[in-house]
Interface confidence: medium
C-alpha cells in the first residue's frame, strides 16, 4: 500500500487520574504506514526518555495501516512542576517531525 502519515494527538492526564496522584500523558498516532516510526517526548523543551511506554497495534485488516500510543508516566507532583509537554513523531512520510504540544496551565 502507499505510505501514509500518522494522525497525531496528545492528551493530558484525566482529572480523575490526577486526583489519584498519577499522571499519564498520552500521544496517540493513528493509521500510518509503514510501521517504522520514532516518538520523542519533551518536557519544557528538554527530551525525556525514562517513563515512556510505546505500544503498537496489529496491522489493520481493512487498510493495512498501523497505530500506536506512546505514554509518558509521571507522578502528579512531577507533572505539576512542568508546563509544556510535547510529542514529536518522525516518520518517512515527512522530512520534519510532526509535533503536538500542550501547556498544562491552559488545560
Amino acid at each position: 500500500r502507499a505510505d501514509a502519515a500518522p494522525t497525531v494527538s496528545i492528551f493530558p492526564p484525566s482529572s480523575e487520574q490526577l486526583t489519584s496522584g498519577g499522571a499519564s500523558v498520552v500521544c496517540f498516532l493513528n493509521n500510518f504506514y509503514p510501521k517504522d516510526i520514532n516518538v520523542k517526548w519533551k518536557i519544557d523543551g528538554s527530551e525525556r526518555q525514562n517513563g515512556v511506554l510505546n505500544s503498537w497495534t496489529d496491522q489493520d485488516s481493512k487498510d493495512s495501516t498501523y497505530s500506536m500510543s506512546s505514554t509518558l508516566t509521571l507522578t502528579k507532583d512531577e507533572y505539576e512542576r512542568h508546563n509544556s509537554y510535547t510529542c514529536e513523531a518522525t516518520h518517512k512520510t515527512s522530512t520534519s517531525p510532526i509535533v503536538k504540544s500542550f501547556n498544562r496551565n491552559e488545560c
Epitope: 492528551f11 493530558p12 492526564p13 484525566s14 482529572s15 480523575e16 487520574q17 489519584s20 498519577g22 499519564s24 498520552v26 496517540f28 511506554l53 505500544s55 497495534t57 496489529d58 497505530s67 500506536m68 500510543s69 505514554t71 508516566t73
Partner: nanobody, 129 residues
C-alpha cells in the same frame, strides 16, 4: 456480560447535526472511561473522542474538535456524541467502546484495539446531500 448498544445514526445533509447514544450494561459503567471510534468504508478504525470515568476530562481527535461533543450520564449508563457541522468525510459506522477496546483507557494510557475490551455493533452515519 458487557453490552453496548449504539443508536442515533442516519442520513444527514452536510452542515447538519446528529446525536449518537450508547447504552451500556453488564459492568459498572461509572468505573470506565468511554470512547467513540469510527470506521469509514474501506478504512481502518479511527479513534474520535473519549471521556473519563467521571466525565471530568474529554478528548477529541483534531478533525472533530469544535464540532463534536462527548458527554455521559452515569445514572443512565449512557454515553453520547453530539455531532454538529457534519461533513461528508464524517460518514462512517460509529462505535462506542470501553475497557481496553478499540481506543485506549485514558486513566492508564493502555492501547489495545484488538484486545479484551468491548465495543458495540455500531450505528451508521451518512453525510450526503
Amino acid at each position: 456480560q458487557v453490552q453496548l448498544v449504539e443508536s442515533g445514526g442516519g442520513l444527514v445533509q452536510p452542515g447538519g447535526s446528529l446525536r449518537l447514544s450508547c447504552a451500556a450494561s453488564g459492568f459498572t459503567f461509572s468505573n470506565y472511561d468511554m470512547s467513540w471510534v469510527r470506521q469509514a468504508p474501506g478504512k481502518g478504525l479511527e479513534w474520535v473522542s473519549a471521556i473519563s470515568s467521571g466525565g471530568g476530562s474529554t478528548y477529541y481527535v483534531d478533525s472533530v474538535k469544535g464540532r463534536f461533543t462527548i458527554s455521559r450520564d452515569n445514572a443512565k449508563n449512557t454515553v453520547y456524541l453530539q455531532m454538529n457541522s457534519l461533513k461528508p468525510e464524517d460518514t462512517a459506522v460509529y462505535y462506542c467502546a470501553t475497557g481496553s477496546g478499540p481506543a485506549f483507557r485514558l486513566s492508564g494510557g493502555s492501547w489495545s484495539p484488538r484486545g479484551d475490551g468491548s465495543r458495540g455493533q455500531g450505528t451508521l452515519v451518512t453525510v450526503s446531500s
